[in-house]
Interface confidence: low
């Protein structure tokens, strides 16, 4: 089996070899590429924190796990990891923290068998519509992922293109509907402030869905309904103020559903009276013991378990007469 | 002892098709990749083909791509080179070669004597 | 497709005599880079793999190196049976290919 790269296969700054579609494997696609580590028994390559600024071009056709962690790759382009044979046996794929800033249409194609694909703490600008499905078709041929883990890849503020950032990333997720089998989905940390209304209806396989870490206010758009196979659903630390009648019911009829609360800023007045009814009954909220009210002021710190609908008042609205600027 | 032998060669009319065999011995034919590499008269070495062990992907220089087909047979250790359309500058020697699949870039490192194809009318 | 190109494409030299052949690739191959040897109407004989290693047999005269993507066979002192053409080859991507050949001649 291959070993870690030996002194004989030193790395060569001058740019690996690029077909125009496809980067042609060696003869003998077996070996260790330069700056990584291979195990043929554990079918794994790890080319990690190497300041590599392209994916290696020589990588061992028995790669099943691959770890390009800690690099400087800038750009994924299409067909990055497209090799002559393919890289057929390629399951997990773990891109985090290489700067990637653009992923380009197709950047994952010809890789039959990848369940498991991690772009997590990459600052995405740019991030292809079809970077995920491969072509632009109204309908592409299904993607193979299982789970796809893009923590932390919002870009800062100032790198951003002048478009939505959620709206960028759902068009990946469903461009060409090819994620239709996607179990996993992870979108923690990346300051999002609303979820674009249709993604979750067109991902009906999720089984796991990671929104926590976000600035989300509201669900009021947002259907769980089709998710029927859920399982968990984060939305720790986000700035909900409060989930309405439609959600609650919605969560409540998913039959296999944990929901993750924690760390939310609650609004504690009248329009909290369903969610805390609902909460008092429910089992799918994990922890709901310690949800408390963020405001108002007199509320703050309440356990949401422990009001009662006495506690859950709303101002008067003043009459026009007597308002203030 | 490991040994490629080469048959199948000799003379066709520009055309036609010939069928080159590479019976292997004295190693695990499934633990290598095949190569055919061939040498026109005077001239220097032009890889053809390789297949992988398995049998299952095949590469072809594109010279040839369209009219060779390389294939192995693993229950006879046996790797095959099909040519069709033959053309004249098809003529050389045709030699098959193994390639280490366990060895970090370990070069052709057993050939076959050779078996000559001439392409003539 | 990376050319190999090497050079000189002759050379005339006595026993004893240090040679030294080069090959230069279009691109990046890494380390994929062998040395044949040929003698007239046989089959090749591999000296050096992955740029550098000496195959098992080859007598230690020969060496290999790199140096980017140049790449150099090194015979230390010729000897009479050395008086071959020698290849230099790429197999780091499809399609393989060879140098042009460099035929080491008796002086």
């Known amino acids: 089996s291959s070993s870690p790269t030996s002194s004989a296969s030193s790395f060569s700054s001058s740019a690996p070899f690029l077909a125009s579609a496809v980067s042609a494997q060696p003869p003998l696609p077996d070996q260790c590429p330069a700056l990584c580590e291979c195990s043929e028994a554990a079918r794994t390559v790890k080319c990690v924190n190497r300041n590599l600024t392209e994916v290696p071009t020589d990588l061992p056709a028995y790669v099943r796990n691959l770890f390009l962690t800690g690099n400087q790759l800038a750009v994924l382009p299409a067909g990055a990891f497209a090799r002559r044979p393919p890289l057929a046996e390629l399951a997990a794929l773990n891109l985090s923290g290489s700067r990637l800033d653009e992923v380009r249409a197709g950047a994952f194609e010809h890789l039959p068998s990848l369940r498991q694909l991690d772009l997590s703490h990459n600052p995405l600008a740019d991030l292809s519509p079809f970077a995920f499905s491969g072509s632009n078709a109204s309908v592409s041929a299904p993607s193979p992922l299982v789970e796809l883990i893009l923590n932390h890849i919002v870009p800062p503020e100032d790198e951003r293109q002048n478009r939505s950032f959620e709206g960028m990333v759902v068009a990946a997720l469903l461009a060409g509907r090819a994620l239709q089998g996607l179990r996993r989905l992870e979108l923690a940390s990346n300051h999002f402030l609303y979820l674009p209304r249709d993604v979750l209806a067109q991902l009906p396989s999720l089984r796991h869905l990671d929104l926590s870490n976000n600035s989300l206010v509201s669900l009021t758009y947002v259907s769980f309904r089709n998710l029927t196979h859920l399982e968990s659903l984060h939305l720790e630390d986000n700035a909900l103020k409060v989930l309405h009648n439609g959600t609650l019911a919605e969560l409540q009829g998913l039959p296999h559903i944990r929901v993750f609360l924690d760390n939310n800023p609650w609004v504690c007045d009248c329009h909290m009276a369903d969610m805390v009814t609902w909460l008092k009954e429910t089992e799918v909220v994990q922890g709901k013991d310690r949800l408390t009210c963020a405001y108002p002021e007199k509320m703050r710190n309440r356990v949401l378990l422990e009001l009662n609908s006495a506690d859950l008042d709303c101002d008067p609205i003043l009459p026009p007469s007597l308002q203030t600027s | 002892e490991v040994q490629l032998v080469e048959s199948g060669g000799g003379l066709v009319q520009p055309g036609g098709s010939l069928r080159l065999s590479c019976a292997a011995s004295?190693?695990?034919?499934?633990?290598?990749?095949i190569h055919w590499v061939r040498q026109a008269p005077g001239k220097g070495l032009e890889w053809v083909a390789y297949?992988?062990?398995?049998?299952?992907?095949?590469e072809y220089a594109d010279s040839v791509k369209g009219r060779f087909t390389i294939s192995a047979d693993t229950s006879k250790n046996t790797a095959y080179l099909q040519m069709n359309s033959l053309r004249a500058e098809d003529t050389a020697v045709y030699y098959c070669?193994?390639?280490?699949?366990?060895?970090?870039?370990?070069?052709?490192?057993?050939w076959g004597q050779g078996t000559l194809v001439t392409v003539s009318s | 497709d990376i050319q190999m190109t090497q050079s000189p494409s002759s050379l005339s030299a006595s026993v004893g005599d240090r040679v030294t052949i080069t090959c230069r690739a279009s691109?990046?191959?890494?380390?994929?880079v062998a040395w044949y040897q040929q003698k007239p109407g046989k089959a090749p004989k591999l000296l050096i793999y992955?740029?550098?290693s000496l195959y098992s047999g080859v007598p230690s005269r020969f060496s290999g190196s790199r140096s980017g993507t140049d790449f150099t066979l090194t015979i230390s002192s010729l000897q009479p049976e050395d008086f071959a053409t020698y290849y230099c080859?790429?197999?780091?991507?499809?399609?393989?290919?060879f140098g042009q050949g460099t035929k080491v001649e008796i002086k």
């Open positions: 070669a193994r390639y280490d699949r366990s060895t970090r870039y370990s070069g052709l490192d057993y």
């Open positions: 004295g190693f695990t034919f499934s633990s290598y990749y």
């Open positions: 297949i992988t062990s398995t049998g299952s992907y095949t």
């Open positions: 691109q990046s191959v890494s380390s994929a």
């Open positions: 992955s740029a550098s």
């Open positions: 080859q790429q197999a780091y991507a499809t399609p393989v290919t």
